[in-house]
Interface confidence: low
């Protein structure tokens, strides 16, 4: 299709080489079409456009995105050629930064229903460059946390080194919707709720003698609870002794609750004490079995193929730790009375003999 009639917008993405960040392009179709095609209307509910030249209001089609090669080749369908660029309704998400994202991006409605619709398109000229090292050290992160229930603020990374007084007028979006209540380089949140979480975009205009560009940055905002002040607690095993049958397989599960930490490095391991020896056991990976706003429950199992006489003399210890401290729970195995027949006991003794030989040839010291 002929793109000469498309409205044009110039954008600049100055990415930080120090951190991962994303970028977003909106399909800014001319009003009133934009409000009709995309779920990011800038009209208030009371402002209804006079006419909708595109399509029936019951259809809310997506838009189609293209990239225009610099050498004049035909337009490329982004979905096919650029796996790191994701199409989502009326937005284009760049998952990884890099100068190779520089180029012209065109969007238009997928469904064209009348001759007037053909010119309904937007061409975005995107320039991508690494941020100069001269920019300030304390620039805001592209991932920002807000503490639930407290006051907080979201800063525009590309302007965070400027004072509010010298900052240009900023346009903010949250999850693709225009936020009209602020034009400064910071959004101040009086009380943080869960719904403050999301993808924020801040835009401001930068002009030189030749042309003007929209400088854009994307911020992922997380709403979090405060870091825990408690060490983890072990929910299971509760008992310090466990009745077992000799010669039978056994799984002992350790479940522990870890309070929320912004930097979360949980430690959970099993080790065995036998007389004056102590060693860590190689067990399956720990897995998260429940996550909530305030804590996470993690489970890790120790698996014995067959319980031996030697296991009855050992202590099995689950050790858990976070940045505050550690907790342990010891389990001693106790033979179930009258459970196994003579064959089971002979079999268990045979296994124990093999294991003793193997243990003496390896004896892994833990401490």
């Amino acid at each position: 299709f002929n793109i000469s009639g498309c409205s044009t917008k110039k954008l600049l993405w100055a990415y930080s080489t120090r951190s991962e960040e994303e970028f977003i392009l909106f399909c800014d179709l001319p009003e009133p079409q934009k409000s009709h095609f995309c779920h990011r209307s800038q009209l208030s509910p009371t402002q209804v456009p006079d006419h909708l030249p595109f399509t029936d209001s019951k259809d809310l089609p997506d838009v189609q995105w293209y990239r225009q090669p610099s050498n004049g080749d035909p337009l490329e369908d982004i979905r096919k050629s650029y796996p790191h660029i994701i199409q989502d309704k009326c937005t284009l998400r760049f998952l990884t930064p890099g100068v190779n994202n520089t180029g012209s991006y065109i969007c238009r409605p997928k469904m064209i229903k009348s001759p007037y619709d053909v010119a309904c398109c937007v061409k975005m000229i995107l320039e991508v460059k690494p941020q100069s090292n001269a920019s300030c050290e304390n620039s805001a992160s592209h991932k920002q946390d807000l503490l639930l229930g407290s006051t907080g603020s979201i800063s525009c990374p590309s302007l965070s080194c400027q004072s509010d007084a010298q900052s240009p007028e900023v346009t903010w979006y949250k999850n693709g919707k225009l936020l009209s209540m602020t034009r400064s380089n910071r959004i101040v949140v009086d009380e943080v709720y869960i719904y403050h979480q999301g993808t924020y975009v801040c835009d401001y205009t930068q002009s030189d003698t030749a042309s003007s560009w929209t400088v854009r940055a994307v911020v992922q905002v997380r709403t979090i609870v405060g870091d825990t002040k408690l060490k983890p607690d072990i929910l299971d095993p509760v008992e310090s002794t466990l009745e077992v049958e000799l010669g039978k397989p056994l799984t002992i599960s350790c479940k522990a609750r870890f309070g929320f930490e912004r930097v979360f490095n949980p430690v959970m391991k099993w080790y065995i004490k036998d007389a004056d020896l102590e060693w860590e056991v190689s067990v399956p990976e720990a897995k998260s079995i429940k996550s909530t706003l305030k804590d996470e429950i993690i489970e890790r199992n120790i698996i014995l193929e067959k319980v031996t006489q030697r296991d009855l003399r050992r202590t099995f210890v689950c050790f858990v730790q976070n940045s505050i401290g550690n907790t342990t729970q010891s389990v001693q195995l106790k033979e179930k009375r009258g459970s196994g027949g003579l064959n089971d006991i002979f079999e268990a003794q045979k296994i124990e003999w093999h294991e003793t030989v193997r243990f003496q040839s390896h004896h892994h010291h833990h401490h």
């Epitope: 869960i194 719904y195 997380r222 909530t292 706003l293």
Partner: antibody, heavy 123, light 107 residues
Framework: QVQLQQSGPGLVKPSETLSLTCTVS????????WTWIRQPPGKGLEWIGY???????NYNPSLKSRVTISVDTSKNQFSLKLSSVTAADTAVYYC?????????????????WGQGTTVTVSS | AIQLTQSPSSLSASVGDRVTITCRAS??????LAWYQQRPGKAPKLLIY???NWESGVPSRFSGSGSGTDFTLTISSLQPEDFATYYC?????????FGQGTKVEIK
């Protein structure tokens, strides 16, 4: 423990507006999304829409033109209005709490449900 | 809207049986899937969220797995109280949608 108590008429005439209310007890309406879901007789579940405690809404496009969900934080209540009803709107209507669980980033769970209100559209 | 297709639509099983229900999404939804149990005349009850996490108080015989487009709910040893209808639901993009349900009946 949070509980959701539904109220509203069980019979609505065609072309009229269906109105249901869900009262939250044992907890606050703050910090959550509040959802309506319906289930026609012998059929599956259909999401109608949600409202947050701040009043922001999101509706199923198939019902958007007829649905209004509102919240009254002072009464710990949220409500559903469905206009111009027909026999096809006969269903059990449920209210539910939608929690955002945070660990790294977000996902959603509908963890508390109302008891359900059977609404019949008939003249 | 994302469509979720459950299979089978219904199944007959005995107490103690291992039961597997699958849910297929019409497009990738990462792990944004929940499973619910609904007994006759009752509201749905959340079992699993984020594809594989147990909701508090749900017995460990229920487990969920999968990501992308294919998901599974497994009941390792069916109990009398497990005879019900099970629904999957996606939380990946609006509108939230449900599968058509799988009815687990007594053989």
């Amino acid at each position: 423990q949070v509980q959701l108590q539904q109220s509203g008429p069980g019979l609505v005439k065609p072309s009229e507006t269906l109105s249901l209310t869900c009262t939250v007890s044992g907890g606050s309406i703050s910090n959550y999304y509040w959802t309506w879901i319906r289930q026609p007789p012998g059929k599956g579940l259909e999401w109608i829409g949600y409202i947050s405690d701040s009043g922001s809404t999101n509706y199923n496009p198939s019902l958007k033109s007829r649905v209004t969900i509102s919240v009254d934080t002072s009464k710990n209540q949220f409500s559903l209005k469905l206009s111009s009803v027909t026999a096809a709107d006969t269903a059990v209507y449920y209210c539910a709490r939608e929690t955002i669980v945070v660990r790294g980033f977000y996902f959603y769970v509908m963890d508390v449900w109302g008891q359900g209100t059977t609404v019949t559209v008939s003249s | 809207a994302i469509q979720l297709t459950q299979s089978p639509s219904s199944l007959s099983a005995s107490v103690g049986d291992r039961v597997t229900i699958t849910c297929r999404a019409s497009q990738g939804i990462s792990s944004a899937l929940a499973w619910y149990q609904q007994r006759p005349g009752k509201a749905p009850k959340l079992l699993i969220y984020d594809a594989s996490n147990w909701e508090s108080g749900v017995p460990s015989r229920f487990s969920g797995s999968g990501s992308g487009t294919d998901f599974t709910l497994t009941i390792s040893s069916l109990q009398p109280e497990d005879f019900a209808t099970y629904y999957c639901q996606q939380f990946n993009s609006y509108p939230w949608t449900f599968g058509q349900g799988t009815k687990v009946e007594i053989k």
